[in-house]
Amino acid sequence: SGLNDIFEAQKIEWHELPRWRQQWSGSGTTSRFPETVLARCVKYTEVHPEMRHVDCQSVWDAFKGAFISKYPCNITEEDYQPLVKLGTQTVPCNKTLLWSRIKDLAHQFTQVQRDMFTLEDMLLGYLADDLTWCGEFNTFEINYQSCPDWRKDCSNNPVSVFWKTVSRRFAETACGVVHVMLNGSRSKIFDKNSTFGSVEVHNLQPEKVQALEAWVIHGGREDSRDLCQDPTIKELESIISKRNIRFFCKNIYRPDKFLQCVKNPEDSSCLSGI
């Protein structure tokens, strides 16, 4: 198959040599990383007609070029530019769903509401979701032993810079009403230091984005507080309003019922609040 042909040609490049290597505090590159990225790319382009023309070998070349042979604490957004270019993908207006600290529910939602998209529903997010990767300076090897940890080693590592880069672009290209799912169980429902708070919020374009609607997801079954009045949500509202984007907020008191009602909106119990 095409996959085998590609990796047959790269066996020499990826073989492991017994040599000294930098020890980082984070876990190493995900096992079979090149194969996983390529297989995900092939699967994605087969399922999404608008990306069918994308050449997955070129995508892998661009991905690998962003971090291979580079010192893994000195990665820049510019390193990922070729990959971002090949992964260019438009989300229709009003269909962008951002999330912070509540990834699983956001993904469950877009799996049901197929016309809305999180970053991980896009090609680049799909390729990298839940994976770790890094290389080493001046060698063509992938480091499967350890990779830099954001806190203990450095923030400019391959994984962190990737997510910052693609998150920035995802927000930058959104339009209409943008939605964000926030975790109401956390002490900081809106966290300025999260990817959403530090990158996405600041890259929404006021000339294209009319409003940001926050969905605050409640954790406890009996939690009837209005978490839209939380100080951190008020802080988010202030940031967004200063950027000339309108802000709306909704409490999702019953996330289980919320998902059920997305699946079956005609259900009589869905006519009452969720």
Partner: antibody, heavy 121, light 108 residues
């Protein structure tokens, strides 16, 4: 800083031809270089692009896949190899440099004057 | 497919020209569209990027607007030097490009 194309010629249908794009005053490293063509009396049509900081990253318009190959032969030259040429490939071929910077991709800031390829028996 | 209208337009010096570009599908990011000026025997010249941003060295008489799939280039205070063919260019999924068919501007 400028670009110049060369290699345009009159060839017979079925023939192959290689065009060269040469940079003056800058290197192709860290720039996307693309080929665009214009048939006589027609509009512009994108062909292919290449980015070559260390390894080559290249991609093509759907219609160009298989018959056209873009390569970087030095830090200041990029080639476009064309095979199985037909009359429909008769055009002026331009190479162009994309605007640099991650928020500016998608536009061509600098173009060569073009080289004419004529396919006729 | 990018459809430009009109295919040709005549304008008097000092007048205004409006060129439309209709895209069959929304461009990337809803505003990733450029405009070029092309004169015979010369390479095309970038005028406008991201729909409304003026390229370096381009006079402010040129204005771009629109988003999604409908865009407009307006040339105000037309000068004889503006006689050329103008092309819109969209940027699409996977980094692909498409050009409009061109609009010839004749200045009288």
């Amino acid at each position: 800083q400028s670009l110049e194309e060369s290699g345009g010629d009159l060839v017979k249908p079925g023939a192959s031809l290689t065009l060269t794009c040469t940079a003056s005053g800058f290197s192709f490293n860290n720039y996307w270089i693309c080929w665009i063509r214009q048939a006589p009396g027609k509009g512009l049509e994108w062909v292919a692009c290449i980015y070559s900081p260390s390894g080559d990253i290249k991609y093509y318009a759907n219609w160009a896949k298989g018959r056209f190959t873009v390569s970087k032969t030095s830090s200041t030259t990029v080639t476009l190899q064309m095979t199985s040429l037909t009359g429909a490939d008769t055009a002026t071929y331009f190479c162009a440099r994309e605007l640099s910077g991650s928020s500016y991709e998608g536009y061509f800031e600098s173009w060569g004057p073009g080289t004419l390829v004529t396919v006729s028996s | 497919v990018l459809t430009q209208t009109p295919s040709s337009v005549s304008a008097a010096v000092g007048g205004t020209v409006t060129i439309n570009c209709q895209c069959s599908q929304s461009v990337y990011g809803h505003n990733w569209l450029a405009w070029y000026q092309h004169k015979p025997g010369q390479p095309p010249k970038l005028l406008m990027y991201r729909a409304s941003n003026l390229a370096s060295g381009v006079p402010s008489r040129f204005k771009g607007s629109g988003s999604g799939s409908q865009f407009t280039l307006t040339i105000g205070e037309v000068q004889s030097d503006d006689a050329a063919t103008y092309y819109c260019q969209g940027y699409y999924n996977g980094g692909s490009y498409a050009f409009g068919g061109g609009t010839e501007v004749v200045v009288r």
